[in-house]
């Protein structure tokens, strides 16, 4: 019998100061590059070691970014999302969704998304 996999979803506001090498993370997703099945949202695929996000410590690989400086990231092309981040200024406010897997039985499967490939 298969166990049920639940997710504890929390939201958090993260304020980052852009570092010498930018914000210090990579993103995937968008309407033209779906990362999770039936979801065109923008997700964190990699945190750069010693970058701004890593030094802050709250943003995690796999997090969904809901907004940047109050601007919603829904229904954006991937490159439009990239441009929004790159042009977001020195102080950047991110609304993020953390999704923590709560396992009840065998390990489940989260769409086709896998930040590490």
């Amino acid at each position: 019998m298969n166990g049920r996999v639940d997710y504890l979803v929390t939201e958090e506001e993260i304020n980052l100061t852009r570092g010498p090498s930018g914000l210090g993370f990579n993103i995937v997703g968008g309407t033209d590059q779906q990362y999770v099945s039936n979801d065109s949202g923008i997700y964190v695929s990699r945190i750069k070691e010693n970058g701004a996000a890593a030094l802050d410590g709250r943003l995690q690989e796999g997090d969904k970014i809901l907004s940047v400086n109050g601007q919603d990231l829904k229904n954006l092309l991937h490159q439009d999302a990239v441009d929004l981040f790159r042009n977001a200024g020195y102080a950047v406010s991110l609304r993020v969704q953390h999704r923590l897997q709560v396992q009840n039985g065998p390990i489940g499967h989260r769409g086709e998304g896998d930040p590490s490939g």
């Epitope: 990579n26 995937v28 990362y35 750069k48 991937h78 490159q79 981040f85 086709e112 590490s116």
Partner: nanobody
Framework: HVQLVESGGGLVQAGDSLRLSCAAS????????MAWFRQAPGKERDFVAT????????NYADSVKGRFTISRDNAKNTVTLQMNSLQPEDTAVYYC???????????????????WGQGTQVTVSS
Amino acid sequence: HVQLVESGGGLVQAGDSLRLSCAASGITFRWYTMAWFRQAPGKERDFVATINWSGSDTNYADSVKGRFTISRDNAKNTVTLQMNSLQPEDTAVYYCAGVPGTSLSGETDPRDYDYWGQGTQVTVSS
């Protein structure tokens, strides 16, 4: 298990062309930024070129601009580097590299990449 396998290196004369290829497996290739780096004997690994997930955006080191062209085929999980007008100073081991997603930090530092091939030797004689 992630694998990046380069091919196409060899010994050529100055002014000749070579086409390097990198075959990726074990990753969802279409999500990845891909790049080529090179390392000459006794020197650091240097950035050559990078290409975004869709192939619409490329970036080149100044030393190869106008001579080298990076491209990708997401259907075949391959990235290629077409090298024209090769010079002796292009002699190096060429490495394919990949990282998931689009960087908001930079894409020219080897530390920006998670996965690497074993390299292919390119030697240009004068």
